[in-house]
Interface confidence: low
Amino acid sequence: MMTGTIETTGNISAEKGGSIILQCHLSSTTAQVTQVNWEQQDQLLAICNADLGWHISPSFKDRVAPGPGLGLTLQSLTVNDTGEYFCIYHTYPDGTYTGRIFLEVLESSVAEHGARFQIP
């Protein structure tokens, strides 16, 4: 029985040329996370494997950086980056959990940054 839930940064917006942090958090389960995939529509952006660590897809290596945590940092944003992003948690024994984030990249300087972090 899958009891876990995925929390995400939800719908976020950012300025063209800027950076944004995509975050997902799997909670309410004791399942072991074996791998997290980050995907944009049908394209694989990055993988974080429990044994092998991070792998960034070669076509995104210049613009995608790992972290914080299992999150992903996107930089040099363009309007073409607008769209759905998915964090896919592969777990044992539960199976697969998927979280969805919608990113809108705006031309203007009124973009509202959804991914904020509090400094302890």
Partner: nanobody, 117 residues
Amino acid sequence: EVQLVESGGGLVQPGGSLRLSCAASGFTFSPSWMGWFRQAPGKEREWVASVLRGGYTWYADSVKGRFTISADNSKNTAYLQMNSLKPEDTAVYYCTTDRGYNWNYDWGQGTLVTVSS
């Protein structure tokens, strides 16, 4: 308990250099990556650079060609060499990392870098 301790900040003139260090301790196992963020007064915290345990590095566009991130895996220490510093680089610089492989990650207390003549 994971601890991240940054050092190396200070006052430097425009065009000058600084080297920041971040010593990480208390890990159950070594982090897969380490990184630097910064926060200028009145602004949001922004990502600066990341380095994978395997050595691959990434940089924000604003620091490319001026900053170099590196790590000594045996010491769980990350470094940020900052050259050709500009007044707009003035900020508190924070080190961050994951705790090996899980969601949790940690922040250091930060080190202040002031670029001014």
